[in-house]
């Protein structure tokens, strides 16, 4: 399944164990933690990646939201329950029987409750806003060059169909990448915008999930684009349900 046969590795997911134990000695790769076999020709789901990474440290901070319904992942890392397809289960619970509902990118979208909490469906995150600040450069980047380079990155590195990159905005030093993907637009085999955003997030932090590739080397017309701060905002098809006086949604910020 496009795991490299010669040395039996998974090009798109280093958080796997690969073994020549498929039929006829074929290489097959399983995600750490869950044991689910992964397709190494495409991105692995964020849920399986988080499960593999559950021992990583928590990182949290709170900042202003661009929209009252936007979510950011403030709860940091947790060991998620994934369904057989590798998607987040709508309800997540911790070891102490505290439960909450999540969206399709695994971000909490309700107050925490107990085991009686019901999460009827997995609500899709259909709009992701990636907010970046780049390090100072001699001058501003050319907007159309920047736009083209980021679209190329998402198409080639993350295999995200170009139609899901809705816009690239730029006001030096802030870059915003908008990803949009409704349930009806996502065809079988399409990379999920949540997975692409997570791979990008890890790349920007210098924690690439790709096997053996160098880290992210973003250049616009030869000029290095170095990201010093990343914020990712998630908008769901159905607004989140927090109690009235909640002012800070969860936030997973990446300071880099």
């Amino acid at each position: 399944h496009t795991a490299a046969q010669d040395n039996c590795t998974c090009p798109t997911n280093k958080m796997t164990v690969c073994s020549p134990d498929g039929p006829g000695g074929r290489c097959q790769c399983r995600a750490l933690g869950s044991g689910v076999a992964v397709d190494c020709s495409t991105l692995t789901s964020k849920c399986l990646l988080l499960k593999a990474r559950m021992s990583a440290p928590k990182n949290a901070r709170t900042l202003v939201r661009p929209n009252e319904h936007a979510l950011v992942d403030n709860d940091g890392l947790y060991d998620p329950d994934c369904d057989p397809e590798g998607r987040f289960k709508a309800r997540q619970c911790n070891q102490t029987s505290v439960c909450w509902c999540v969206n399709s990118v695994g971000v909490r979208r309700t107050d925490k409750g107990d085991l009686s909490l019901r999460c009827d469906e997995l609500v899709r995150t259909h709009h992701i806003l990636i907010d970046l600040r780049h390090r100072p450069t001699a001058g501003a980047f050319n907007h159309s060059d920047l736009d083209a380079e980021l679209r190329r990155l998402f198409r080639e590195r993350y295999r995200l169909h170009p139609k899901f990159v809705a816009a690239v905005h730029y006001e030096q030093p802030t870059i915003q990448i908008e990803l949009r993907q409704n349930t009806s637009q996502k065809a079988a085999g399409d990379v999920d915008i949540g997975d692409a955003a997570y791979y990008f997030e890890r790349d920007v932090k210098g924690e690439s999930l790709f096997q053996g590739r160098g880290g992210l080397d973003l250049r616009v017309r030869g000029e290095p684009l170095q990201v010093e701060r990343t914020l990712i905002y998630y908008l769901d098809e159905i607004p989140p349900k927090f109690s009235m006086k909640r002012h800070h949604h969860h936030h997973h910020h990446h300071h880099h």
Partner: antibody, heavy 115, light 111 residues
Amino acid sequence: QVQLQQSGPELVRPGTSVKMSCKAAGYTFTKFWIGWVKQRPGHGLEWIGNIYPGGAYINYNENFKGKATLTADTFSSTAYMQLNSLTSADSAIYYCAREGSSGYWGQGTTLTVSS
Amino acid sequence: VMTQSPSSLTVTAGEKVTLSCKCSQSLLNSGTQENYLTWYQQKPGQPPKMLIYWASIREPGVPDRFTGSGSGTDFTLTINNVQAEDLAVYYCQHDYSYPFTFGSGTKLEIK
């Protein structure tokens, strides 16, 4: 050819521990998962857990966490399973197996827990 | 949960036998497009022997009268022209995700 040779039968007292071995030969030990399976008459087969000797990755069935400890020694190409706080319910045949296609199994180690 | 049926059956040599294994969740991996189901044969006093991997791939050396089929949650092991040496307990096991689990087995007896 691939072989998994398990240690001999064990007769032990309740409350004690036992460590059984599974020596692999005929393949690269560090490249394949080794699984452990329990078989009790009338209880069928139960997957205890597995270990990947190439990176010491270990997974346990929740039912055996705290009961079983899996380890591996890459120098001797041997996998081990320790069972602690033994009771009569632990009396069974324990198999090691190379997981994946062409699954090879050891001959089994019979454990009897009796006072 | 892996449910096997029947729990036992007795057949005459030469007959065709169909063993069933049902799983409470789909074993079809949408990424790899494989069904992570294995069939084992265990003869008295022996360890289990793998017959079928990925639901339908016969292991080398396994007679072609053994055929695995099915997808998702429902799987079948068919034994054509049953022989006296096929007397055994047959187990299915999934290796879709941890913990890998086995069915309770089907005991095949020959008249």
